[in-house]
Every structure is written in structure tokens, then in C-alpha cells.
Interface confidence: low
Amino acid sequence: QAGPLPKPTLWAEPGSVISWGNSVTIWCQGTLEAREYRLDKEESPAPWDRQNPLEPKNKARFSIPSMTEDYAGRYRCYYRSPVGWSQPSDPLELVMTGAYSKPTLSALPSPLVTSGKSVTLLCQSRSPMDTFLLIKERAAHPLLHLRSEHGAQQHQAEFPMSPVTSVHGGTYRCFSSHGFSHYLLSHPSDPLELIVSGSLEDPRPSPTRSVSTAAGPEDQPLMPTGSVPHSGLRRHWE
């Protein structure tokens, strides 16, 4: 065969963002000539795992029965054919949620906003965190507030939206994380529904409580755990 072997495809089911204790399956798909599959995890001894291909030999399954901190991280896979090892797959970032208590998500000045006006979604944690992630249900990508290099420890991140349009309406959640491990996220915040009305004459009642004044971190209660959405959440680190 001329040239390097094509790189395999790596993905996770039911997704790459998994709550603590849940099962996840990592799949590596190569070619029908594959004899063996290897999965490497960044900062772990290589190979992290080896598997024989499943018939018809073009893919292998790597099972994680119960998600923990140890499994969170960046993975690549390879396959071996009679002519040698393939190129590495594109990386898969496996993220675990539930590592920290959930943050509080609120809308300032209110979750009921008139089209054309401004609103800020505020994600607050009780303990200092470095990174805050905002997701919207059914959105392709999360909005992300990256780790700040400031000599300060963040308890909150602001996600300003201006001018607001009907596209901004929907249900949001946020997560918090420490910069030293981008692959461990908090439990998700309680959902916040942002309602965009067409005009001031047509207000609709808001289903969520608004926090109109910002509280310090000492005022933020630790919340019980919540459920985790898997769909539509991908990591985009700048």
C-alpha cells in the first residue's frame, strides 16, 4: 500500500460528555484490514488499552462501565494492518460532569427580555473556579468563558447578549471547572429559560426566578446534584 494508512475515526456513545457513574463506550473505526486497535490516553502510559477488532474487523469497542475522574481526558486511537500502524485518529475529549457542586445560573436584569434589549446570563459558583461553560439546549456549540489569566479566582462568569433576538430564547445551563483539568466539569446548573418577547406590550410570565443583584461567593448555596444533558455539547477551547 502506498503512503500512510488512513487515520481511524474515534467517537463515544452516548456522547463525549458523561456524568459520573454512567457508562460510556469508545469506538475506533479503521479499515477491514485492521488486525488490532490501540487506544492512547494523553498523559497515561501507552497503550491505554488494546482490543481485537469486531467483525467485520473495521472497528473496535473500548468500554468504560462507570465514568470516574480517571477516565476523563483526551484520547486517540490507532489500528494495525499487515503493513503497519495507522496515523492517529483525531482526538476525542471525554469530559466528566459531576466533579463539583453545581453553579447557579441567573439572568440580569431578568429572564424575561424584550427583543432588541440586553441581558446577561450569570453563572456563579460558591468556590473559585477557572472556567465556566454555558450551553443552550439543542444548540450545536456551547458558549464558553475561558479560564482567565488574571491574578484572581473567578466565582462567576458573565455571558452578555446584546441585542437580544428571538434566537436567544431557550433553555440554558452552565457548568464550572478548574483550569488544571478541562475534562472535569461540575454538575449542571438548574435550567434557566430565557424568554424573548416581541414588545413591552406583550410580556409573558417568567418560569424562573431572577437574581437582580449580584451576591458574593459566600452567599451562594451549595446545591444538590442534577441531571446532565448529553446531546449537542462539544468542547471548544480557544
Epitope: P128, S148, A152, Q153, Q154, Q156
Partner: antibody, heavy 121, light 112 residues
């Protein structure tokens, strides 16, 4: 009352080590990063870096990598700056400062009174 | 590193006068999150710096309203509308948008 209390003045010889303390009170120590700022006699202010008081992770400005070390004693709400192998150019007043300006919604800024380090043979 | 250039170096004023200090940065101080982390401090002899203005134009708690900050991008100004005796000292601008944080060289406000 929110305050940072720094240790007293130090007189050291070149090549020696000095360790300056900064004790926080009146707020939750682990909620805010601790910055260190150098001011040489008659000169301006120079940011040395900071330490994350929650994780203990230090960040040093390029000019302060190598002989300088930030550390914590979290149980005592105290941050430390250690300077090894002292040189004449280390003679300065060192301030600890706990600063939070990340968002527009609330703000926090408190500085210690400064610790003067004199280096003389 | 971001260089902060303050002018003038020395500013002689009479009590009750208006004073204006300029601070220019070598690159934009607009952070990727939209905030501009440009701050003003006053340092009196033998004391630590005291924060006056944070993020361009926000007065820190307890700072009199005769102090105001303005500017954007790379050019910033601190104004004191009516100078009082307690305002004398060295004023520093400071940026914390980019690491490392940097300070201006200082402007000494003194009696004419």
C-alpha cells in the same frame, strides 16, 4: 475588617534567603488570588505574579522565575514570598495584594502595607 | 509585555484646580471577554497603593466623585475636578488585561 498584614522589615546579606509572610483576615482566604508586587526604592511598581489560594498553583512573571517562590499556609490564611540567593537588585518593598476585578458586578481590592527588604554586605 | 506610558511625569497644581493624567498602552487593553482592565491607583509616601478607579471608569468604594476615569483601547485619562491636599501623591495606571500585569511609571501630583 478586611486586611493583609505583612511581616516586618528584613536586613539580609547577598546570597542569603528571605521569606516574607502575608496574613489575611476578614475574608475567606481561599476565595481570592494573592498577587505579589515589587517596588524598588524611588521606582514604580512591578507585578511579580500570583498564587491561586484555592489550588496552590503559582504563576510567575518572566523576571521572577527561578529564585522566587510563592507558597501558602492555608490553615493560617497566610501567603509567603521566598527569595533565594539574594542580590542587590532585590532590595525593595514587596507588597502582597488580593485583587478581584473579573466582572462588573462586584469588586475586591486589598493590599498589605509592604515589607522592606534591604540587601547589604 | 504591555508598556504603560504615563504623562506627565510631574504635575504641579494649585488646590482647587483640575488635574488630568494620561496613560497610553502599547497594545489594546480590551480583553477577549469584552472588559477593559485599566485601573488607577494613588500611592502616598510610605503607604501601599490605594485603588481609585477600576476598569477605566468605575470608582472604587469610598473614592470621592471628583475622581473620574475615561478612555478606551489604548488611551486613558484620569481627571481630578478639584484637587484637594489629600490628593497629593503618585498616581499609577495599571493594566491586568494581559499577563504580566504592568504599571505606568507614575505621575507625581504636587503643589505648584
Amino acid at each position: 475588617q478586611i486586611q493583609l498584614v505583612q511581616s516586618g522589615p528584613e536586613l539580609k546579606k547577598p546570597g542569603e534567603t528571605v521569606k516574607i509572610s502575608c496574613k489575611a483576615s476578614g475574608y475567606t482566604f481561599t476565595n481570592y488570588g494573592m498577587n505579589w508586587v515589587k517596588q524598588a526604592p524611588g521606582k514604580g511598581l512591578k507585578w511579580m505574579g500570583w498564587i491561586n489560594t484555592y489550588t496552590g498553583e503559582p504563576t510567575y512573571a518572566d523576571d521572577f522565575k527561578g529564585r522566587f517562590a510563592f507558597s501558602l499556609e492555608t490553615s493560617a490564611s497566610t501567603a509567603y514570598l521566598q527569595i533565594n540567593n539574594l542580590k542587590n537588585e532585590d532590595m525593595a518593598t514587596y507588597f502582597c495584594a488580593s485583587i478581584y476585578y473579573h466582572t462588573s458586578l462586584w469588586y475586591f481590592d486589598v493590599w498589605g502595607a509592604g515589607t522592606t527588604v534591604t540587601v547589604s554586605s | 509585555d504591555v508598556v504603560m506610558t504615563q504623562t506627565p511625569l510631574s504635575l504641579p497644581v494649585s488646590l482647587g484646580d483640575q488635574a488630568s493624567i494620561s496613560c497610553r498602552s502599547s497594545q489594546s487593553l480590551v480583553h477577549s471577554n469584552g472588559n477593559t482592565y485599566l485601573h488607577w491607583y494613588l500611592q502616598k509616601p510610605g503607604q501601599s497603593p490605594k485603588l481609585l478607579i477600576y476598569k477605566v471608569s468605575n470608582r472604587f468604594s469610598g473614592v470621592p466623585d471628583r475622581f473620574s476615569g475615561s478612555g478606551s483601547g489604548t488611551d486613558f485619562t484620569l481627571k481630578i475636578s478639584r484637587v484637594e491636599a489629600e490628593d497629593l501623591g503618585v498616581y499609577f495606571c495599571s493594566q491586568s488585561t494581559h499577563v504580566p500585569y504592568t504599571f505606568g511609571g507614575g505621575t507625581k501630583l504636587e503643589i505648584k
